[in-house]
């Protein structure tokens, strides 16, 4: 039976259950290698409290559909008297990078994952030339994940004092250039995550190979590696590396340019200072606040809930936007979607699409930019499930009785941005973490 | 590609204020970052402002701080510039330009320009 995600098939995966102290490896085309689990675990249990080892999922007992990946085992488990076997169950859903598998619950008999991935897509649209898992656990099972750095199109720039050249990298995947015509980006071969420009020629300095490495817990390391023989003749006969350190910084702070911190015979060390390399706890919540010792921050924008089915509406062209943020009143247009963000087309108003549910929100403070996600919603054409992104900007006189509204400002393949002028964005800091 | 158009520009007095816009059409608008640089006779292209797509975070070339804004109209695809305190030396072509490369000011990063917009200051 051939492997149902080939592009997850290079790598073992981690997932943890955080309530519980659980690390989960998980290898959706092999076995994980992992002695304690049996030679063909596919998902193997670590339990950290006990320092045990259980295999939830076997190989061998693999069964498979376009969204949903299961792995039996022989282990009975005793679920209300029935005798079931011991199973693992991926949920697979379209996203726009490699993603990583998450814990959602586990029973007796059943440990379920979902896994937003461009695996998992219809379309063909946002796979990668090549791309690497971009998140990684540390000593103490804290998830840090740099995939909302990961660019679909376009790369950073790296600060670099060399006035003749310019080094462009993304984090993660290769660098998609084909929506720039004419900017110097264009010449970077294709597969490059790393591109170095000298005048009008562009070279391949690096590609993505392993996946994120954490060093301490504060650190975080990415190396791309140029693949194919042929030396460049400026490297002195050496192989072209980049090794990318991003460094969560030790206060909360705004977001810095990637640096060029070391180079000789094209190796090139960078260091990334961003929140995003902080554990996720750090940065995100399921509410609409971030507050305590734990984000050193304090953002409430629970207040921008409406009340008695009145919505926030935001025109966008051929469309409108009904939002209602922070709360789980449903948006009259979209009845029974469970909207948080409902698109409805101006010139046929049965034309309904949620973009967004309230009970799929992620609130995210970093590097400045105070983010609140909607995902979940009405499916498009590639399978991806519509989201909605709003950044808030803090204004103090924002009108609303503080409360602003929020503006349309685009549309990227099934995901709508709005941003947000709010007094409740004023963000009040703490001192360290 | 995206095509980029700018006006606005004409003679003003020093102390004098101006607002350049920048229709944009073409391929999706909300993928890109925006910048205005502007080119003096006799002299290289250099960077006014630039402000990115996903946060509408801005910066601004020192010379220019205090008294330069850079705003967008994601609804009618428009990039402006709304220039105050104008002096003689802000006198050149402005032009608008998109690139996919994020953290630059660099005018060669940029892939789409407009055909520019003349800006002179006198008295």
């Known amino acids: 039976q051939a492997a149902p995600f080939p592009e997850l098939c290079s790598y073992t995966w981690e997932a943890v259950d955080t309530k519980n102290n659980v690390l989960y490896k998980i290898n959706i085309c092999g076995s994980v290698d992992i002695v304690q689990c049996g030679p063909s675990s596919a998902v193997c249990m670590h339990d950290l409290k006990t320092r045990t080892y259980h295999s939830v999922g076997d190989s061998v007992l693999r069964s498979a559909t376009r969204s949903l990946l299961e792995f039996n085992t022989t282990v009975s488990c005793d679920q209300q008297g029935t005798n079931h076997r011991v199973q693992s169950s991926i949920a697979f859903l379209c996203g726009k990078t490699l993603g990583t598998p998450e814990f959602v619950t586990a029973t007796e008999c059943v440990h379920y994952f979902e896994w937003r991935t461009t695996a998992a897509c219809k379309k063909d649209i946002f796979k990668a030339n090549k791309e690497v898992p971009c998140y990684v656990f540390d000593e103490e099972l804290r998830k840090h994940d740099l995939n909302p750095l990961i660019k679909l199109s376009g790369a950073y720039l790296v600060d670099d004092s060399d006035p003749d050249t310019s080094l462009f990298i993304n984090v993660c995947r290769d660098i998609d250039t084909l929506r720039d015509p004419g900017s110097q980006l264009r010449a970077c071969p294709p597969g490059t995550a790393a591109c170095l420009v000298r005048g009008h020629q562009a070279f391949d300095v690096g590609q993505p190979r392993d996946g994120l490495k954490v060093v301490r817990k504060d650190r975080l390391v990415l190396s791309y590696v140029r693949e194919e023989a042929g030396k460049l003749d400026f490297c002195d006969g050496h192989s072209p590396a980049v090794t990318i350190t991003f460094v969560c910084p030790s206060e909360r702070r705004e977001g810095t340019i990637p640096k060029l911190t070391a180079k000789s015979n094209c190796r090139y060390e960078i260091e990334w200072i961003t929140e995003y390399a902080c554990h996720r706890d750090y940065l995100e919540s399921k509410t609409c606040s971030l507050s305590g010792e734990q984000q050193d921050v304090s953002i409430d924008l629970t207040p921008l809930a409406q009340s008695g089915g009145s919505s926030y509406i935001s025109d966008g062209k051929e469309y409108l936007f009904y939002l209602n943020v922070c709360g789980e009143t449903e948006i009259q247009f979209c009845n029974k979607k469970q909207a948080a963000v409902c698109q409805v087309k101006k010139s046929d108003t049965s034309q309904v699409k949620a973009a967004g549910r309230y009970h799929n929100q992620t609130l995210r403070y970093s590097d400045g930019d105070l983010t609140l996600i909607y995902f979940g919603g009405d499916e498009c054409s590639s399978g991806f499930q519509r989201m909605s992104v709003i950044n808030f900007r803090c204004n103090k006189t924002a009108g609303n009785d503080g409360k602003g509204t929020p503006v349309f400002t685009g549309e990227v393949d099934c995901t709508y941005f709005f941003t947000w002028d709010t007094e409740y964005a004023c963000v009040h800091h703490h001192h360290h973490h | 590609d995206v095509q980029l158009v700018e006006s606005g520009g004409g003679l003003v007095q020093p102390g004098g204020s101006l607002r350049l816009s920048c229709a944009a059409s073409?391929?999706?608008?909300?993928?890109?970052?925006w910048g205005w640089f502007r080119q003096a006779p006799g002299k290289e292209r250099e960077f006014v402002a630039a402000i990115r797509w996903s946060s509408s975070k801005t910066s601004y070339a020192d010379s220019v701080k205090g008294r330069f804004t850079i705003s967008r109209d994601n609804a009618k695809n428009t990039i402006y510039l709304q220039m105050n305190s104008l002096r003689p030396e802000d006198t050149a072509v402005y032009y608008c330009a998109a690139s996919i490369v994020d953290f630059t000011t660099n005018p060669s990063h940029f892939g789409s320009w407009g055909q520019g917009t003349l800006v002179t200051v006198s008295s």
């Open positions: 073409g391929r999706t608008f909300n993928t890109y970052n």
